[in-house]
Protein backbone atom coordinates (compact mmCIF):
# COMPACT_ATOMS: atom_id res chain seq x y z
CA UNK A 1 0.00 0.00 0.00
CA UNK A 2 0.95 3.48 -0.18
CA UNK A 3 1.13 6.24 2.74
CA UNK A 4 -1.52 8.73 3.25
CA UNK A 5 -0.88 12.05 2.01
CA UNK A 6 -3.62 13.32 4.04
CA UNK A 7 -6.03 12.71 6.53
CA UNK A 8 -9.65 11.05 5.86
CA UNK A 9 -12.51 13.57 5.71
CA UNK A 10 -13.54 14.51 8.90
CA UNK A 11 -10.04 13.46 10.03
CA UNK A 12 -8.10 16.42 12.36
CA UNK A 13 -4.57 16.75 11.53
CA UNK A 14 -2.06 17.12 14.02
CA UNK A 15 1.81 16.32 14.01
CA UNK A 16 1.69 13.92 11.29
CA UNK A 17 -0.99 11.56 13.03
CA UNK A 18 -5.30 12.08 11.58
CA UNK A 19 -7.78 12.26 14.53
CA UNK A 20 -11.31 11.11 15.20
CA UNK A 21 -13.81 12.53 17.77
CA UNK A 22 -17.00 10.80 18.29
CA UNK A 23 -19.92 12.82 19.41
CA UNK A 24 -21.49 9.39 21.04
CA UNK A 25 -20.46 7.28 23.61
CA UNK A 26 -20.17 3.48 23.74
CA UNK A 27 -18.09 1.17 25.81
CA UNK A 28 -14.26 0.57 25.55
CA UNK A 29 -13.92 -2.47 23.80
CA UNK A 30 -16.86 -1.16 21.04
CA UNK A 31 -14.93 2.09 20.34
CA UNK A 32 -11.38 0.36 20.16
CA UNK A 33 -13.26 -2.40 17.59
CA UNK A 34 -14.60 1.06 15.67
CA UNK A 35 -11.10 2.37 15.25
CA UNK A 36 -10.07 -0.81 14.41
CA UNK A 37 -12.36 -1.24 11.47
CA UNK A 38 -11.58 2.67 10.44
CA UNK A 39 -8.02 1.25 10.06
CA UNK A 40 -6.97 2.84 13.00
CA UNK A 41 -6.66 2.60 17.09
CA UNK A 42 -7.95 4.31 20.34
CA UNK A 43 -5.88 7.40 20.39
CA UNK A 44 -2.66 6.36 22.40
CA UNK A 45 -1.11 10.11 24.04
CA UNK A 46 2.94 10.31 23.74
CA UNK A 47 3.45 14.09 24.75
CA UNK A 48 2.02 16.95 26.34
CA UNK A 49 1.68 18.60 22.93
CA UNK A 50 -0.95 15.54 21.74
CA UNK A 51 -2.69 15.75 25.46
CA UNK A 52 -3.33 19.13 24.92
CA UNK A 53 -4.37 18.57 21.46
CA UNK A 54 -6.99 16.31 22.31
CA UNK A 55 -7.54 18.08 25.14
CA UNK A 56 -8.77 21.39 23.65
CA UNK A 57 -11.10 19.17 21.05
CA UNK A 58 -12.58 17.03 23.38
CA UNK A 59 -13.46 19.90 25.86
CA UNK A 60 -14.97 19.08 29.60
CA UNK A 61 -16.27 15.81 28.77
CA UNK A 62 -15.27 11.94 29.60
CA UNK A 63 -13.53 10.17 26.54
CA UNK A 64 -12.15 6.96 26.11
CA UNK A 65 -8.46 6.99 25.27
CA UNK A 66 -6.06 3.30 23.92
CA UNK A 67 -5.05 2.86 27.68
CA UNK A 68 -5.92 -0.49 29.19
CA UNK A 69 -4.97 -2.75 32.06
CA UNK A 70 -7.10 -5.78 31.19
CA UNK A 71 -4.83 -8.01 31.21
CA UNK A 72 -2.87 -6.84 34.03
CA UNK A 73 -0.06 -4.55 33.26
CA UNK A 74 -1.40 -0.75 31.91
CA UNK A 75 -1.16 -0.90 27.70
CA UNK A 76 -1.03 1.22 25.10
CA UNK A 77 -3.03 -0.61 22.15
CA UNK A 78 -0.24 0.28 19.70
CA UNK A 79 2.37 -1.01 21.89
CA UNK A 80 3.60 1.97 22.88
CA UNK A 81 5.77 1.41 25.95
CA UNK A 82 3.72 2.92 29.28
CA UNK A 83 6.49 2.90 31.56
CA UNK A 84 8.55 4.93 30.35
CA UNK A 85 5.81 7.30 28.65
CA UNK A 86 3.89 10.21 28.84
CA UNK A 87 1.44 9.91 31.62
CA UNK A 88 -1.19 12.49 33.03
CA UNK A 89 -3.58 11.08 35.72
CA UNK A 90 -5.33 12.64 37.95
CA UNK A 91 -4.32 12.61 42.15
CA UNK A 92 -4.87 9.15 43.44
CA UNK A 93 -5.31 7.53 40.02
CA UNK A 94 -5.26 4.97 38.44
CA UNK A 95 -7.09 3.19 41.25
CA UNK A 96 -9.29 -0.22 39.96
CA UNK A 97 -12.00 0.73 42.56
CA UNK A 98 -14.10 -2.34 43.48
CA UNK A 99 -17.39 0.20 44.89
CA UNK A 100 -19.20 1.28 41.77
CA UNK A 101 -21.08 -2.33 42.05
CA UNK A 102 -20.78 -3.34 38.75
CA UNK A 103 -18.07 -5.66 39.22
CA UNK A 104 -14.64 -6.11 38.69
CA UNK A 105 -12.38 -2.87 38.97
CA UNK A 106 -11.34 -0.24 36.51
CA UNK A 107 -9.40 -1.23 33.28
CA UNK A 108 -9.87 1.41 30.95
CA UNK A 109 -8.68 4.95 30.92
CA UNK A 110 -10.29 8.05 30.06
CA UNK A 111 -9.89 11.48 30.02
CA UNK A 112 -11.77 13.29 32.28
CA UNK A 113 -13.39 16.88 32.14
CA UNK A 114 -10.20 18.44 33.27
CA UNK A 115 -8.26 16.57 30.64
CA UNK A 116 -6.56 14.56 33.63
CA UNK A 117 -6.63 10.50 33.31
CA UNK A 118 -8.80 8.06 35.25
CA UNK A 119 -9.46 4.65 35.16
CA UNK A 120 -13.05 3.18 34.90
CA UNK A 121 -15.49 0.59 34.09
CA UNK A 122 -14.35 -0.46 30.52
CA UNK A 123 -18.40 -1.52 29.89
CA UNK A 124 -19.31 3.21 30.67
CA UNK A 125 -20.17 4.51 27.05
CA UNK A 126 -17.77 7.17 26.86
CA UNK A 127 -16.72 9.09 23.94
CA UNK A 128 -13.90 8.26 22.28
CA UNK A 129 -11.28 9.51 19.56
CA UNK A 130 -9.40 7.67 16.78
CA UNK A 131 -6.09 8.17 16.10
CA UNK A 132 -4.00 6.54 12.67
CA UNK A 133 -0.66 7.56 11.59
CA UNK A 134 -0.24 9.17 8.61
CA UNK A 135 2.90 7.76 7.80
CA UNK A 136 1.31 4.21 8.32
CA UNK A 137 0.99 2.46 4.94
CA UNK A 138 -2.73 2.53 4.09
CA UNK A 139 -4.86 -0.45 2.79
CA UNK A 140 -5.67 0.99 -0.48
CA UNK A 141 -3.47 -0.09 -3.44
CA UNK A 142 -1.42 2.53 -5.36
CA UNK A 143 -2.58 4.38 -8.08
CA UNK A 144 -1.18 3.46 -11.41
CA UNK B 1 2.27 42.39 25.66
CA UNK B 2 2.49 38.94 27.69
CA UNK B 3 3.64 39.76 31.28
CA UNK B 4 3.86 37.80 34.23
CA UNK B 5 4.33 40.23 37.37
CA UNK B 6 5.81 37.81 40.64
CA UNK B 7 5.50 39.07 44.01
CA UNK B 8 8.34 40.57 46.20
CA UNK B 9 11.24 38.33 47.80
CA UNK B 10 10.28 36.33 51.32
CA UNK B 11 12.47 35.21 54.21
CA UNK B 12 11.16 32.22 55.84
CA UNK B 13 11.98 30.25 58.84
CA UNK B 14 12.34 26.48 58.63
CA UNK B 15 8.78 24.64 58.95
CA UNK B 16 7.07 27.71 57.95
CA UNK B 17 4.88 28.23 54.45
CA UNK B 18 5.63 30.56 51.62
CA UNK B 19 2.92 31.67 49.39
CA UNK B 20 4.30 33.30 45.72
CA UNK B 21 1.94 35.18 43.39
CA UNK B 22 2.26 35.40 39.49
CA UNK B 23 -0.04 38.32 38.00
CA UNK B 24 -0.36 37.50 34.23
CA UNK B 25 -1.33 40.17 31.65
CA UNK B 26 -1.28 40.78 27.69
CA UNK B 27 -2.86 37.29 26.88
CA UNK B 28 -6.26 35.30 28.03
CA UNK B 29 -5.28 34.10 31.11
CA UNK B 30 -7.57 30.90 31.31
CA UNK B 31 -6.06 29.27 27.80
CA UNK B 32 -2.71 28.47 28.85
CA UNK B 33 -1.53 26.69 31.67
CA UNK B 34 1.07 27.83 34.23
CA UNK B 35 4.20 26.55 35.36
CA UNK B 36 6.23 26.48 38.58
CA UNK B 37 9.61 26.23 37.88
CA UNK B 38 12.83 27.22 41.18
CA UNK B 39 16.51 27.84 40.74
CA UNK B 40 18.70 27.45 43.68
CA UNK B 41 21.27 29.51 44.06
CA UNK B 42 24.15 28.91 41.56
CA UNK B 43 21.90 25.91 40.74
CA UNK B 44 20.06 24.64 37.40
CA UNK B 45 16.42 24.62 36.86
CA UNK B 46 13.93 22.73 38.45
CA UNK B 47 10.09 22.03 37.06
CA UNK B 48 7.34 22.09 40.27
CA UNK B 49 4.43 21.59 38.45
CA UNK B 50 1.65 23.18 36.25
CA UNK B 51 -1.85 24.58 37.05
CA UNK B 52 -4.32 24.81 34.23
CA UNK B 53 -6.50 27.80 35.09
CA UNK B 54 -9.38 27.10 33.09
CA UNK B 55 -10.33 24.60 35.21
CA UNK B 56 -8.04 24.63 38.06
CA UNK B 57 -6.48 20.82 37.54
CA UNK B 58 -2.89 20.96 38.80
CA UNK B 59 -0.12 18.13 38.20
CA UNK B 60 3.14 18.41 40.43
CA UNK B 61 6.09 17.00 40.53
CA UNK B 62 6.56 14.04 42.39
CA UNK B 63 9.57 15.57 44.78
CA UNK B 64 6.97 18.53 45.89
CA UNK B 65 4.07 16.10 46.26
CA UNK B 66 1.98 16.88 49.04
CA UNK B 67 3.57 20.18 50.02
CA UNK B 68 3.32 22.06 46.99
CA UNK B 69 0.01 23.80 46.41
CA UNK B 70 -1.00 25.77 42.73
CA UNK B 71 -4.34 27.85 42.95
CA UNK B 72 -5.61 30.68 40.75
CA UNK B 73 -7.73 33.26 40.88
CA UNK B 74 -9.32 34.00 37.54
CA UNK B 75 -10.45 37.81 38.05
CA UNK B 76 -7.91 39.03 39.15
CA UNK B 77 -5.65 36.72 36.62
CA UNK B 78 -3.56 35.64 38.90
CA UNK B 79 -1.51 31.99 39.52
CA UNK B 80 -0.34 31.20 43.54
CA UNK B 81 2.12 28.70 44.32
CA UNK B 82 1.92 27.80 48.07
CA UNK B 83 5.38 25.52 49.72
CA UNK B 84 4.76 24.16 53.05
CA UNK B 85 7.18 22.80 55.66
CA UNK B 86 9.66 24.96 54.28
CA UNK B 87 13.83 23.27 54.73
CA UNK B 88 16.86 25.28 54.08
CA UNK B 89 17.37 23.33 50.68
CA UNK B 90 13.77 25.26 49.47
CA UNK B 91 15.55 28.70 49.45
CA UNK B 92 16.01 29.39 45.22
CA UNK B 93 14.21 32.09 43.13
CA UNK B 94 10.93 30.37 42.37
CA UNK B 95 9.67 31.50 38.64
CA UNK B 96 5.98 31.06 36.85
CA UNK B 97 5.90 30.97 33.15
CA UNK B 98 3.29 30.44 31.10
CA UNK B 99 2.48 27.33 28.70
CA UNK B 100 3.99 27.41 25.19
CA UNK B 101 4.52 24.78 22.23
CA UNK B 102 6.64 22.39 24.34
CA UNK B 103 8.21 25.27 26.28
CA UNK B 104 7.94 27.60 28.65
CA UNK B 105 7.56 31.04 26.77
CA UNK B 106 7.18 33.67 29.08
CA UNK B 107 8.88 33.94 32.51
CA UNK B 108 7.89 36.03 35.36
CA UNK B 109 11.14 37.73 36.76
CA UNK B 110 10.98 35.70 39.69
CA UNK B 111 11.04 35.36 43.70
CA UNK B 112 13.59 34.81 46.26
CA UNK B 113 13.01 32.72 48.83
CA UNK B 114 15.40 32.50 51.97
CA UNK B 115 14.74 29.80 53.87
CA UNK B 116 16.78 30.78 57.46
CA UNK B 117 16.63 30.36 61.13
CA UNK C 1 12.06 10.21 34.62
CA UNK C 2 14.01 12.04 31.41
CA UNK C 3 17.20 12.70 32.53
CA UNK C 4 19.09 15.55 30.08
CA UNK C 5 22.66 16.27 29.69
CA UNK C 6 24.99 19.07 27.69
CA UNK C 7 28.14 19.30 27.02
CA UNK C 8 30.19 21.10 27.00
CA UNK C 9 29.42 22.65 30.82
CA UNK C 10 31.51 25.62 29.74
CA UNK C 11 32.98 27.26 26.34
CA UNK C 12 35.50 30.07 26.12
CA UNK C 13 34.75 31.92 22.93
CA UNK C 14 35.32 35.27 20.94
CA UNK C 15 32.92 37.53 19.38
CA UNK C 16 31.91 36.42 15.78
CA UNK C 17 32.79 32.66 16.72
CA UNK C 18 30.38 29.98 15.99
CA UNK C 19 29.30 28.08 19.05
CA UNK C 20 27.73 24.66 19.15
CA UNK C 21 26.09 23.03 22.25
CA UNK C 22 24.67 19.65 22.42
CA UNK C 23 22.21 18.35 24.77
CA UNK C 24 21.13 14.46 24.98
CA UNK C 25 17.88 12.82 26.43
CA UNK C 26 18.53 10.01 28.15
CA UNK C 27 14.96 8.11 26.11
CA UNK C 28 13.45 9.47 22.76
CA UNK C 29 11.05 12.70 23.20
CA UNK C 30 10.80 13.73 19.61
CA UNK C 31 11.19 16.97 18.76
CA UNK C 32 9.54 18.02 22.05
CA UNK C 33 12.90 20.39 22.66
CA UNK C 34 13.33 24.08 23.83
CA UNK C 35 16.13 25.95 24.63
CA UNK C 36 16.54 28.88 26.76
CA UNK C 37 19.25 31.94 27.43
CA UNK C 38 19.64 32.63 31.06
CA UNK C 39 21.41 36.10 32.62
CA UNK C 40 22.83 36.37 35.99
CA UNK C 41 19.75 37.73 38.34
CA UNK C 42 17.36 37.90 35.59
CA UNK C 43 14.79 34.90 34.45
CA UNK C 44 15.52 32.48 31.55
CA UNK C 45 14.44 33.46 27.93
CA UNK C 46 13.05 31.26 25.36
CA UNK C 47 15.10 30.56 22.31
CA UNK C 48 13.88 27.61 20.38
CA UNK C 49 10.98 25.58 20.96
CA UNK C 50 9.93 21.90 18.84
CA UNK C 51 13.93 21.37 18.83
CA UNK C 52 13.88 24.06 15.73
CA UNK C 53 11.69 26.79 15.78
CA UNK C 54 12.81 29.77 16.39
CA UNK C 55 11.03 32.12 18.93
CA UNK C 56 9.65 35.20 17.82
CA UNK C 57 12.31 38.48 18.44
CA UNK C 58 15.10 36.07 18.43
CA UNK C 59 18.04 36.75 16.38
CA UNK C 60 18.66 34.49 13.70
CA UNK C 61 21.94 33.44 14.46
CA UNK C 62 20.34 31.35 16.79
CA UNK C 63 19.11 27.76 15.31
CA UNK C 64 18.36 24.42 16.66
CA UNK C 65 17.91 20.92 14.98
CA UNK C 66 17.74 17.52 16.35
CA UNK C 67 15.18 14.83 16.83
CA UNK C 68 14.75 11.85 19.24
CA UNK C 69 17.66 12.15 21.68
CA UNK C 70 19.99 14.12 20.34
CA UNK C 71 19.80 17.54 19.95
CA UNK C 72 22.00 20.95 18.70
CA UNK C 73 21.91 24.66 19.92
CA UNK C 74 23.93 26.42 17.54
CA UNK C 75 24.85 30.24 17.43
CA UNK C 76 26.61 31.03 14.12
CA UNK C 77 28.46 34.53 14.60
CA UNK C 78 28.64 34.82 18.44
CA UNK C 79 27.81 38.53 19.48
CA UNK C 80 28.75 40.40 23.23
CA UNK C 81 25.18 39.95 24.34
CA UNK C 82 25.00 36.11 23.87
CA UNK C 83 27.85 35.50 26.58
CA UNK C 84 25.28 33.88 29.00
CA UNK C 85 24.21 30.29 30.64
CA UNK C 86 22.08 27.93 28.30
CA UNK C 87 19.71 25.17 28.72
CA UNK C 88 17.67 22.55 26.99
CA UNK C 89 14.22 21.33 28.32
CA UNK C 90 12.21 18.56 27.27
CA UNK C 91 8.65 18.85 27.23
CA UNK C 92 7.94 15.73 26.26
CA UNK C 93 6.56 14.35 29.63
CA UNK C 94 6.33 15.15 33.11
CA UNK C 95 8.14 15.65 35.26
CA UNK C 96 9.24 18.27 33.14
CA UNK C 97 13.25 18.40 33.21
CA UNK C 98 15.81 20.40 32.32
CA UNK C 99 19.89 20.09 31.19
CA UNK C 100 22.75 21.30 33.61
CA UNK C 101 23.27 24.27 31.79
CA UNK C 102 26.34 25.12 29.15
CA UNK C 103 28.36 28.74 30.19
CA UNK C 104 29.28 30.77 27.21
CA UNK C 105 32.23 33.34 28.24
CA UNK C 106 34.47 35.47 26.64
CA UNK C 107 38.06 33.60 25.93
Known amino acids: GSERACCPVNWVEHERSCYWFSRSGKAWADADNYCRLEDAHLVVVTSWEEQKFVQHHIGPVNTWMGLHDQNGPWKWVDGTDYETGFKNWRPEQPDDWYGHGLGGGEDCAHFTDDGRWNDDVCQRPYRWVCETELDKASQEPPLL | QVQLVQSGAEVKKPGASVKVSCQAS????????MHWVRQAPGQGLEWMGWINPNNNATNYAQKFQGRVTMTRDTSISTAYMELRRLRSDDTAVYHC??????????WGQGTLVTVSS | DIQMTQSPSSVSASVGDRVTITCRASQGIRKWLAWYQQKPGKAPKLLIYAASSLQSGVPSRFSGSGSGTDFTLTISSLQPEDFATYYCQQANSFPFTFGPGTKVDIK
Open chain 2, 26 to 33: GYTFTGYH
Open chain 2, 97 to 106: ARDGTSSFDY
